[in-house]
């Protein structure tokens, strides 16, 4: 008799999830000498232990603590780039400006990027059919709780000037309900962080508006200022040109020397 299984509204666990996590861990630790001490099998066991046999709507940050401990990593706290709704460009940027780090440039972020996972209560099976959707089912699901946990820790580690890349093409350039708006903004430490610098990325070629004057950016400025952190905002009108200039700063059309 086929066992009844809860049908969730979201996509199921990414196929070959265990193999993918393990392979990513091995690759990351090979090219990052400061993480060579990490035992990837232990990392996978801790990852698995966070959600296997647990109800996928009942996951807590505590469940991820063994994984957090194994994945502890020091990144230069003054080189952190947060992002909201513009992940691809943020990652392209840290590929050409390698001294800056997004969460997905850290081991734990790299392991989980673009993956979905969940288990089932009281069985050791991984659910490849469906997983809870944050809105339609529950917020305390394995994926959401993981990103909330690692995002909080990442923001807490930041210091000096913290940068955030925001998508200027969206109706809400700053969205209070995004991971950045709901988790990271509130976990920056005012005693360590001097300034949050927002980079608003323009979408249209002819868009010359100052999106730093957008009401949602003003809302972000207000939230940050109330936390005793300075705020600055810059428009990046041509993201393609920006990336090219970051890569080749001596190009005559790019340079402004300091």
């Amino acid at each position: 008799v086929p066992r009844w299984r809860q049908q969730w509204s979201g996509p199921g666990t990414t196929k070959r999830f265990p193999e993918t996590v393990l392979a990513r861990c091995v690759k990351y630790t090979e090219i990052h000498p400061e993480m060579r001490h990490v035992d990837c099998q232990s990392v996978w066991d801790a990852f698995k232990g966070a959600f296997i046999s647990k109800h996928p709507c009942n996951i807590t940050e505590e469940d991820y603590q063994p994984l957090m401990k194994l994945g502890t990593q020091t990144v230069p706290c003054n080189k952190i780039l947060l992002w909201s709704r513009i992940k691809d460009l943020a990652h392209q940027f840290t590929q050409v400006q390698r001294d800056m780090f997004t969460l997905e440039d850290t081991l734990l972020g790299y392991l989980a990027d673009d993956l979905t996972w969940c288990g089932e209560f009281n069985t050791s099976k991984i659910n490849y059919q469906s997983c809870p959707d944050w809105r339609k089912d529950c917020s305390n699901n394995p994926v959401s709780v993981f990103w909330k946990t690692v995002s909080r820790r990442f923001a807490e580690a930041a210091c000096d000037v913290v940068h955030v890349m925001l998508n200027g093409s969206r109706s809400k350039i700053f969205d209070k309900n995004s991971t950045f708006g709901s988790v990271e903004v509130h976990n920056l430490q005012p005693e360590k962080v001097q300034t949050l610098e927002a980079w608003v990325i323009h979408g249209g070629r002819e868009d010359s508006r100052d999106l730093c004057q957008d009401p949602t950016i003003k809302e972000l400025e207000s939230i940050i200022s109330k936390r005793n952190i300075q705020f600055s905002c810059k428009n990046i009108y041509r993201p393609d040109k920006f990336l090219q200039c970051v890569k080749n700063p001596e190009d005559s059309s790019c340079t402004s020397e300091i």
């Epitope: 090219i31 990052h32 000498p33 400061e34 020091t74 230069p76 080189k79 400006q97 390698r98 001294d99 000096d160 980079w199 810059k234 428009n235 990046i236 009108y237 041509r238 040109k241 920006f242 200039c245 970051v246 700063p249 790019c254 340079t255 402004s256 020397e257 300091i258």
Partner: antibody
Framework: EVQLLESGGGLVQPGGSLRLSCTGF????????MSWVRQAPGKGLEWVAD????????YYADSVKGRFTISRDNSANTLYVQMNSLRAEDTAVYYC????????????????????WGQGTTVTVSS | QSVLTQTPSVSGTPGQRVTISCSGV??????VSWYQQLPGTAPKLLIF???QRPSGVPDRFSGSRSGTSASLAISGLQSEDEADYYC???????????FGGGTKLTVL
């Protein structure tokens, strides 16, 4: 023309002190991260210390930690290194250097290189 | 603390291409820069960010990077290229500069 001029070198006895200065011209000194690098006679380059643009972050080589202090006076466009408890092995030509940074579409980025160097000033520690 | 290792000396004849290597770059996120020091003068930046040339540096000089090693190539060797060449990297994790021991280039 972008230029750095060091001064303050000389002969000093072991255990003595010396302060080197480096004045910047032709660039916005306030925005520049600065370094001291030294070269012992017939030897290679050795980094000594680094300071952020506003002086709030300083970094030192293990060989000088606790004895040397890097500082800056942005109003005078001048970088300093105060050298105490000097030893014979501190004998070298001392160069100041500007850290390479660029503003790319108003975003300030660090390019992890020293793009302007002074002519050097010689420090001799001997009795 | 990491150490960058350079071949102590290389030589070549005018017009030739020579390569100077630098191994032991401790992290893929650390950039390598190269400096030329002519006899009796201060060092001069030749290459930054692994392979980028500052304006004013001839395109005969080129940098490359592969994992933990970097190299500086000089093509069309000229007598005025006779100098000491140093690789360096800022360790973004330890906040220290590390220099290679230098390579003496002799133009025969």
């Amino acid at each position: 023309e972008v230029q750095l001029l060091e001064s303050g070198g000389g002969l000093v006895q072991p255990g003595g002190s010396l302060r080197l200065s480096c004045t910047g011209f032709g660039f916005t000194f306030t925005d520049a991260r600065m370094s001291w690098v030294r070269q012992a006679p017939g030897k290679g380059l050795e980094w000594v210390a680094d300071i952020s643009s506003y002086g709030d972050n300083t970094y030192y080589a293990d060989s000088v930690k606790g004895r040397f202090t890097i500082s800056r006076d942005n109003s005078a466009n001048t970088l300093y290194v105060q050298m105490n408890s000097l030893r014979a092995e501190d004998t070298a030509v001392y160069y100041c250097a500007k850290r390479m940074e660029r503003e790319v579409m108003t975003i300030k980025l660090d390019y992890h290189a020293m793009d302007v160097w002074g002519q050097g000033t010689t420090v001799t520690v001997s009795s | 603390q990491s150490v960058l290792t350079q071949t102590p000396s290389v030589s070549g004849t005018p017009g030739q291409r020579v390569t100077i290597s630098c191994s032991g770059v401790f992290n893929i996120r650390n950039y390598v820069s190269w400096y030329q020091q002519l006899p009796g003068t201060a060092p001069k930046l030749l290459i930054f960010k692994d392979d980028q040339r500052p304006s004013g540096v001839p395109d005969r000089f080129s940098g490359s990077r592969s994992g933990t090693s970097a190299s500086l190539a000089i093509s069309g060797l000229q007598s005025e290229d006779e100098a000491d060449y140093y690789c360096a990297a800022w360790d973004i994790f330890l906040n220290v500069w590390v220099f290679g021991g230098g390579t003496k280039l002799t133009v025969l």
